[in-house]
Interface confidence: low
């Protein structure tokens, strides 16, 4: 099994505090207000807490289709988050999983810097494309950009 | 203050496993993620893995998939690292580290070290 | 894996001199790089984080540079106790990897 590591650092104005009550405990609510669109349905199985599965079906048109995320930790303390995407189309065929971990650091400033490190767990020696990393960069950054827009307005 | 202390030195045989412990004081046990790193004699520093002691998931390094295993206990705030199957090339100096903030992989403090010495 | 290569792999200084320790990455790793020292015996301590940040507690004749492949650790008036081992690691990509050290000896 090959071992793939990618890290995305975003930048707020919005404290690590609130962004981590949006990006992650009120997500199911927020999203759907901040980026109507974004995903077509979320099916949630279970309390929230880890061990819940979301199971997301993204809007047709787009090169990903389904993807299933597992819940590993979420510490309200340390503004960490551990997901798993761990099914769906998003995998490629070749990955086994992508291990997830965010963590939200305050900034002097007031705001704070979402870190994403994305660990990618591939079938053999399988590598994922940069084109594939450049696109879910793409897609997440839009999407965390859109709920801190939000935030910023509510 | 933040300390991490080690369980004592071992003595193993080929084959057999050791289980070494890591008893952490002076923060949080939770908020920080737990490493652990080798050291042969004489040589350089090896990451084996980590454990989030806020769930009890595990990252290891693929050399030491299928024989190492890592632990913790919130309720004494121990995290344990066990190594199954050892070789003469196994004996090394075992560090346990806690990241610097949460987890962004800084091995911020360390363990005394717990040599660990596999001799038939 | 990413491969870290240190220079020179010993060095042999005198109190007050300044001294510079290269730390190459075989990729890019933007600015997880972190540098750590070791006396004999004991268990290694942080002393820069992500390239820069002197730990809290390191001596300020410490510092750190770089980015990408390429990193410095910069002593700038080397003490007594500096005498030891420095590592430096990388913090961007699984497994972790160390430099494999460069020892600062007493001329």
């Known amino acids: 099994m090959g071992v793939q590591t990618h890290v995305l650092e975003l930048t707020s104005s919005v404290s690590a505090e609130k962004i981590f009550q949006g990006f992650v405990i009120d997500v199911d609510t927020v999203l759907p207000k901040a980026a109507p669109g974004a995903y077509k349905s979320v099916e949630i199985k279970g309390d929230g807490g880890p061990g819940t599965l979301k199971i997301i079906t993204l809007p047709d048109g787009g090169p990903i289709t389904t993807m299933t995320l597992r819940i590993d930790g979420v510490n309200k303390e340390a503004l960490t988050f551990d997901y798993s995407v761990i099914d769906g189309d998003i995998l490629l065929g070749f990955i086994e999983s992508i291990e997830n971990h965010v963590v939200l650091v305050p900034t002097a400033d007031g705001g704070s810097i979402c870190k994403t490190t994305a660990i990618f767990h591939t079938k053999g020696d399988a590598v994922v494309p940069e084109e594939n990393i450049k696109y879910a960069n793409e897609q997440n950054t839009a999407l965390f950009k859109a709920l801190e827009a939000y935030l910023i307005a509510n | 203050q933040v300390q991490l202390v080690q369980s004592g030195a071992e003595v193993k045989k080929p084959g057999a496993s050791v289980k070494v412990s890591c008893k952490a004081s002076g923060y949080t046990f939770a908020a920080h993620y737990m490493h652990w790193v080798r050291q042969a004699p004489g040589q350089g520093l090896e990451w084996m893995g980590w454990i989030n002691t806020y769930t009890g998931g595990t990252n290891y390094g693929q050399k030491f998939q299928g024989r190492v295993t890592m632990t913790r206990d919130t309720s004494i705030t121990t995290a344990y690292m066990e190594l199954s199957r050892l070789r003469s090339d196994d004996t090394a100096v075992y560090y346990c580290?806690?990241?610097?903030?949460?987890?962004?992989?800084?091995?911020?403090?360390w363990g005394q070290g717990t040599l660990v010495t596999v001799s038939s | 894996d990413i491969q870290m290569t240190q220079s020179p792999s010993s060095l042999s200084a005198s109190v007050g001199d300044r001294v510079t320790i290269s730390c190459r990455a075989s990729q890019n790793i933007k600015n997880y790089l972190n540098w750590y020292q070791q006396k004999p015996g004991k268990a290694p301590k942080l002393l820069i984080y992500e390239a820069s940040n002197l730990q809290s507690g390191a001596p300020s004749r410490f510092s750190g540079s770089g980015s990408g492949t390429d990193f410095t650790l910069t002593i700038s008036s080397l003490e007594p106790e500096d005498f030891a081992t420095y590592y430096c690691?990388?913090?961007?990509?699984?497994?972790?990897?160390f430099g494999q050290g460069t020892k600062v000896e007493i001329k």
């Open positions: 580290a806690r990241d610097r903030r949460n987890w962004n992989f800084v091995f911020e403090y």
């Open positions: 690691q990388q913090s961007f990509s699984i497994p972790w990897t």
